[in-house]
């Protein structure tokens, strides 16, 4: 996360990270008590190596009495998503079991409406991407709010030029932004989960850029045919 | 095998319900959510809803939210789907159908009820 | 809602004919779309899934294909049996819709 904050410890229980041999490779959200929600493309990185998933975690090195690592029983990437493309930029993983829930494991509510968010409203981002240009990674979760922008503006031939389809939105990204290992994480508008954070290679926190969030609501018959 | 069995055929009055039954066997009855589907003579499908057995959760096409309500029995492996102010417009056969498959992912189709036929007439 | 245009309503065929069905999505599904056979007093029957994928038992005659929003199934060689109508549907999203069916005959 780029120009944000650290975020308050535990605030937000739905918050995973995926981590590969025990390094953080990207964010998650909890969904359901089995099911973390995450990017497709966060697989491609893991390569052949031990996928788990953190939760009920602040830092990601101290011990915590709420964080527990699950093992994850079945990875289920969206069919259409593709290496080249942030098209349908989605992954389910079923952990091994059920999450032990409490005051810092919840799952978090996902929008099923398929209705764009306004313009203008403010989401919360959460990650432990990095949070500097140099690459800095924190230890503690990190948070910042963005203004939805509007499809049209961030489709802009200036902007992402017509790649951002009606199954994508974008947050403003002027010098506060996602970045890199924030992938997969949350983007949280009035208590609902609207967006998944993409995992495209795209530059951080240039307002010309704007961050590209996958929209959950376009995809509800997929992750409900999954999580049935 | 996996089967639904559905309800016979039923006629009705304007105005008034029906209640229709699918009875699952051949597989534990909370493993799948369970959909119907709606075909009116020489036309096409219309998705009506689910009904995930194991939690109750209904999801309901909104054109049909106020016209139908699902419900299911895990006692007796059974769902059932209520129709409620009837019209000429719900005459249809209405079948109940279920996703077995292997990749666990996406609303397709792979086990259908026989259907049951709605003929509202006064 | 998305639409699923099934443009033709019948379509004459000779058996040991290859013949194409088409349906067109009014919007992006992706690949998130099945084809259904459905004879005469009959419930529909799984053909394909995930628009390239035979159902368990499909005769590989059966085949699915698709370029952008135009799904195709390609039936080769068409059989007696074969005769029937044949539905697409998208469960990309809610609500799940169908095409309104193409009616194979023979010539």
């Known amino acids: 996360i780029l120009g944000g904050r650290e975020a308050e410890a535990h605030a937000r229980p739905y918050m995973a990270s995926v981590q590969v041999n025990g390094e953080h490779l990207c964010g998650g959200v909890l969904v359901a008590e089995q099911w973390v929600l995450s990017a497709a493309h966060c697989l491609e990185d893991a390569a052949d190596g031990k996928v788990q998933v953190l939760l009920g975690a602040h830092s990601l090195s101290q011990p915590e009495p709420s964080k527990r690592l699950y093992d994850v029983l079945r990875a289920v990437p969206h069919p259409d998503s593709r290496p080249d493309t942030i098209d349908h930029d989605l992954l389910l993983l079923q952990l091994s079991e059920k999450a032990t829930l409490g005051p810092a494991v919840r799952p978090l509510p996902w929008q099923r409406v398929d209705r764009d968010v306004e313009p203008g409203t403010l989401c919360d981002v959460a990650g432990w991407g990095i949070v500097s240009h140099a690459g800095r990674r924190p230890d503690r979760l990190q948070h910042v709010l963005l203004p939805v922008l509007d499809r049209a503006t961030c489709n802009r031939r200036t902007h992402h030029d017509g790649a951002i389809t009606q199954r994508m939105m974008c947050a403003e990204s002027n010098r506060r932004d996602s970045c890199k290992g924030d992938s997969g994480g949350p983007l949280v508008c009035g208590g609902v989960l609207e967006g998944v954070v993409t995992s495209g290679s795209r530059v951080c926190g240039n307002r010309k850029k704007p961050g590209i969030y996958t929209r959950v609501a376009s995809y509800a018959a997929w992750i409900d045919s999954v999580l049935a | 095998q996996v089967q639904l069995q559905q309800s016979g055929a039923e006629l009705a009055r304007p105005g008034a319900s029906v209640k229709m039954s699918c009875k699952a066997s051949g597989y534990t009855f909370t493993t799948y959510t369970i959909h119907w589907v709606k075909q009116r003579p020489g036309q096409g499908l219309e998705w009506i809803g689910y009904?995930?057995?194991?939690?109750?959760?209904?999801n309901y096409n909104q054109n049909f939210a106020d016209k139908a309500t699902l419900t299911a029995d895990r006692s007796s492996s059974t769902a059932y789907m209520q129709l409620s102010s009837l019209t000429s417009e719900e005459s249809a056969v209405y079948y109940c159908a279920i996703r077995l498959g292997y990749d666990r992912q996406g609303w397709y189709f792979d086990v259908w009820g026989a259907g049951t036929t709605v003929t509202v007439s006064s | 809602d998305i639409v699923m245009t099934q443009s033709h309503k019948f379509l004459s065929t000779s058996l040991g004919d290859r013949v194409s069905i088409t349906c067109k999505a009014s919007q992006d599904v992706g690949s998130a779309v099945a084809w259904y056979q459905q004879k005469p007093g009959q419930s529909p029957d799984l053909l394909i899934y995930w628009t390239f994928t035979r159902h368990t038992g499909v005769p590989d005659r059966f085949t699915g294909s698709r370029s952008g929003t135009d799904f195709t199934l390609t039936i080769s060689n068409v059989q007696s049996g074969d005769l029937a109508d044949y539905f697409c549907q998208q469960y990309s999203n809610y609500p799940l819709t169908f095409g309104g069916g193409t009616k194979l005959e023979i010539k």
């Open positions: 009904i995930n057995p194991s939690s109750d959760f209904t």
